[in-house]
């Protein structure tokens, strides 16, 4: 069946642990990418930033797992009103960040 | 200001009971969830329990399950913790803290009281 | 149940700089908290959710948390920063807050 919110925020919290973990030389190349709020509708602005970085296998599976998240389809060159425009950032800081939002999310129970 | 009082330390025998309360003033109470932790003489800090903050839920550390309860009474601001079948072991200053209160029970602790010490000796 | 492991001492020469380390297998996937504690006294909050600062503690104090270790970095450190100092964590899948044992700093 389906596996259920929580189990999939945990698995995708652990991935970004194994990412930030493992950086041996510079994430994805050192690729910058667009900062995002970290508000409602997060998911969808996540991967909307993270699909642009194309070649970067390191974030292949948190782009399918963040896909998980977003209830719409995400393609390269999309942007919502959540990216913060003026603003790029190192892919290994995005994910920093990203991590530690979501272990705040996983704490209030907000799992979707 | 926001200060958490802790009293019914003492000594007491193996195998007895003893209750400790700690007293809240200078917040909002009701709102926090409620920890004991407790630390032996020269020994590191070790978790005793929580009480959420409407008091709907309890959890506690494998040393003291079965053995303690923590109870709260909003209307009082007090927080109690009943310990029965007092053992050597349980020797410690027992500390109350409050930690907002999520979901989950993963907030650090804000707020410590000065402890209480329990001496369980024959 | 959670096992969060740090050195039992560290030794720093004043206006060094100290790191105190608090492992565990994916730490980074929790939140951690770190206390100080001075002899007599109860603990006092550092740092909490992994790097973050309580308003009262000077910006000397910093933390960071990455895949199974997370530490505590104290800047310039003072003959007052002298104390017992504990990481912290909520186990999720037992339900239990898991103290580390902790780390004695002493500034020679």
């Known amino acids: 069946g389906p596996v259920p919110p929580s189990t999939a925020l945990r698995e995708l919290i652990e991935e970004l642990v194994n990412i930030t973990q493992n950086q041996k030389a510079p994430l994805c190349n050192g690729s910058m990418v667009w900062s995002i709020n970290l508000t409602a509708g997060m998911y969808c602005a996540a991967l909307e930033s993270l699909i642009n970085v194309s070649g970067c296998s390191a974030i292949e599976k948190t782009q399918r797992m963040l896909s998980g998240f977003c209830p719409h389809k995400v393609s390269a060159g999309q942007f919502s009103s959540l990216h913060v425009r003026d603003t790029k950032i190192e892919v290994a800081q995005f994910v920093k960040d990203l991590l530690l939002h979501l272990k705040k999310l996983f704490r209030e129970g907000q799992f979707n | 200001q926001m200060q958490l009082v802790e009293s019914g330390g003492g000594v007491v025998q193996p195998g007895r009971s003893l209750t400790l309360s700690c007293a809240a003033s200078?917040?909002?109470?009701?709102?926090?969830?409620m920890h004991w932790v407790r630390q032996a003489p020269g020994k590191g800090l070790e978790w005793v329990g929580v009480?959420?903050?409407?008091?709907?839920?309890?959890h506690y550390a494998d040393s003291v399950k079965g053995r303690f309860t923590i109870t709260r009474d909003n209307s009082k601001n007090t927080l109690n913790l009943q310990m029965n079948s007092l053992r050597a072991e349980d020797t410690a200053v027992y500390y109350c803290?409050?930690?907002?209160?999520?979901?989950?029970?993963?907030?650090?602790?804000?707020?410590w009281g000065q402890g209480t010490m329990v001496t369980v000796s024959s | 149940s959670y096992i969060l492991t740090q050195p039992p001492s560290v030794s720093v020469a004043p206006g060094q700089t100290a790191t105190i380390t608090c492992g565990g297998n994916?730490?980074?996937?929790?939140?951690v908290h770190w206390y100080q504690q001075k002899p007599g006294q109860a603990p006092v909050l550092v740092i909490y959710?992994?790097?973050d600062r309580p308003s009262r503690i000077p910006e000397r104090f910093s933390g960071s948390n990455i895949g199974n270790t997370a530490t505590l970095t104290i800047s310039d450190v003072e003959e007052g920063d002298e104390a017992d100092y504990y990481c912290?964590?909520?186990?999720?899948?037992?339900?239990?807050?898991?103290f580390g044992g902790g780390t004695k700093l002493t500034v020679l």
């Open positions: 803290a409050r930690a907002p209160q999520w979901y989950l029970t993963a907030e650090a602790f804000d707020l």
């Open positions: 200078g917040f909002e109470f009701r709102t926090y969830g």
């Open positions: 912290q964590v909520w186990d999720y899948s037992s339900d239990t807050m898991v």
């Open positions: 959710d992994d790097s």
């Open positions: 994916l730490i980074g996937a929790k939140l």
């Open positions: 009480i959420w903050d409407d008091g709907s839920n309890t």
